[in-house]
């Protein structure tokens, strides 16, 4: 569900939303750390209705959700939750 990508691309997100999306409607979360052409951290959410949205990393709900996912990943090893793709 939660993925971290290190890319050499510029910023992917033109607009960010802080609107709450319950986890039941989320298919995948992609985290793009700042650097490599983009000065900010970006979070991209793929929803179960096939739409995609960029989420404000400061939104409280996404911070809470990522914490839950991190806890879940640490208790359900060996299934990886963080995937690092180095170009």
């Amino acid at each position: 569900v939660l993925e971290v990508y290190y890319t050499s691309l510029r910023c992917r997100c033109v607009q960010e939303s802080s609107v709450f999306i319950p986890r039941r409607f989320i298919d995948r979360i992609q985290i793009l750390p700042r650097g490599n052409g983009c000065p900010r951290k970006e979070i991209i959410v793929w929803k179960k209705n096939k739409s995609i949205v960029c989420v404000d990393p400061q939104a409280e709900w996404i911070q809470r959700m990522m914490e839950v996912l991190r806890k879940r990943s640490s208790s359900t090893l060996p299934v990886p939750v963080f995937k690092r793709k180095i170009p």
Epitope: F20, R24, F25, K47, N49, S51, A59, E60, V68
Partner: antibody, heavy 123, light 106 residues
Framework: EVQLVESGGGLVQPGGSLRLSCAAS????????MSWVRQAPGKGLEWVAT????????YYPDNVKGRFTISRDNAKNSLYLQMNSLRAEDTAVYYC????????????????WGQGTLVTVSS | DIQMTQSPSSLSASVGDRVTITCKAS??????IAWYQQKPGKAPKLLIH???TLQPGVPSRFSGSGSGTDFTFTISSLQPEDFATYYC????????FGGGTKLEIK
């Protein structure tokens, strides 16, 4: 007091269409996602559709995807379910339910439900 | 899709009894389970969400526990008004209801 009142049910032939409505009151309708859940006679509950508070996102299970469309009119405090290509197995009581609070971050499920409207698909 | 296996499907008990209903998820749903009560001809009523959080106004004789895939709903001392059908609902990944448990008077 939260109130949800469904209407629009009735008898329809297989392949036909029907539009259900749900009138909401007693809460800020535009701040909540809304759902439809159905119950076939003598059977259990089955989720049918959910729409986000602003109406921009809709979600469906595979068995109704492409046939049913959920929509809302926040100015009228109303929720709708357009049902096309109806089948005998769509026969059920259809409930409208209040879902998660769109402006929050608590992942809570459907809390208030209407009394339901009966849809019968038969020739 | 996540399946929710609820058991038993029916249960006979007496006023004052302690009653337990279980729901097993086909995969990890964390604590995202809710429990509903439904009486004949009526709409379902939410009793518990997030495994163990009681809705306002719901009596403390109702409780829930579990995490991951195995969940339990308990009525500590049955009251006459508790005879109804109970459903679990997972809301971790879309929505799936359990098949229901009809609680009848012995």
């Amino acid at each position: 007091e939260v109130q949800l009142v469904e209407s629009g049910g009735g008898l329809v032939q297989p392949g036909g269409s029907l539009r259900l409505s749900c009138a909401a009151s007693g809460f800020t309708f535009s701040s909540y996602a809304m759902s439809w859940v159905r119950q076939a006679p003598g059977k259990g509950l089955e989720w049918v559709a959910t729409i986000s508070d602003g109406g921009s996102d809709a979600y469906y299970p595979d068995n109704v995807k492409g046939r049913f469309t959920i929509s809302r009119d926040n100015a009228k405090n109303s929720l709708y379910l357009q049902m096309n290509s109806l089948r005998a197995e769509d026969t059920a009581v259809y409930y409208c339910a209040r879902d998660y609070y769109g402006s929050g971050y608590e992942d809570s499920p459907m809390d208030y439900w209407g009394q339901g409207t009966l849809v019968t698909v038969s020739s | 899709d996540i399946q929710m296996t609820q058991s038993p499907s029916s249960l006979s008990a007496s006023v004052g009894d302690r009653v337990t209903i279980t729901c097993k998820a086909s995969q990890d749903i964390n604590k995202y389970i809710a429990w509903y009560q439904q009486k004949p001809g009526k709409a379902p009523k939410l009793l518990i969400h997030y495994t163990s959080t009681l809705q306002p106004g719901v009596p403390s004789r109702f409780s829930g526990s579990g995490s991951g895939t195995d969940f339990t709903f308990t009525i500590s001392s049955l009251q006459p008004e508790d005879f109804a059908t109970y459903y679990c609902l997972q809301y971790d990944n879309l929505y799936t209801f359990g098949g229901g448990t009809k609680l009848e008077i012995k």
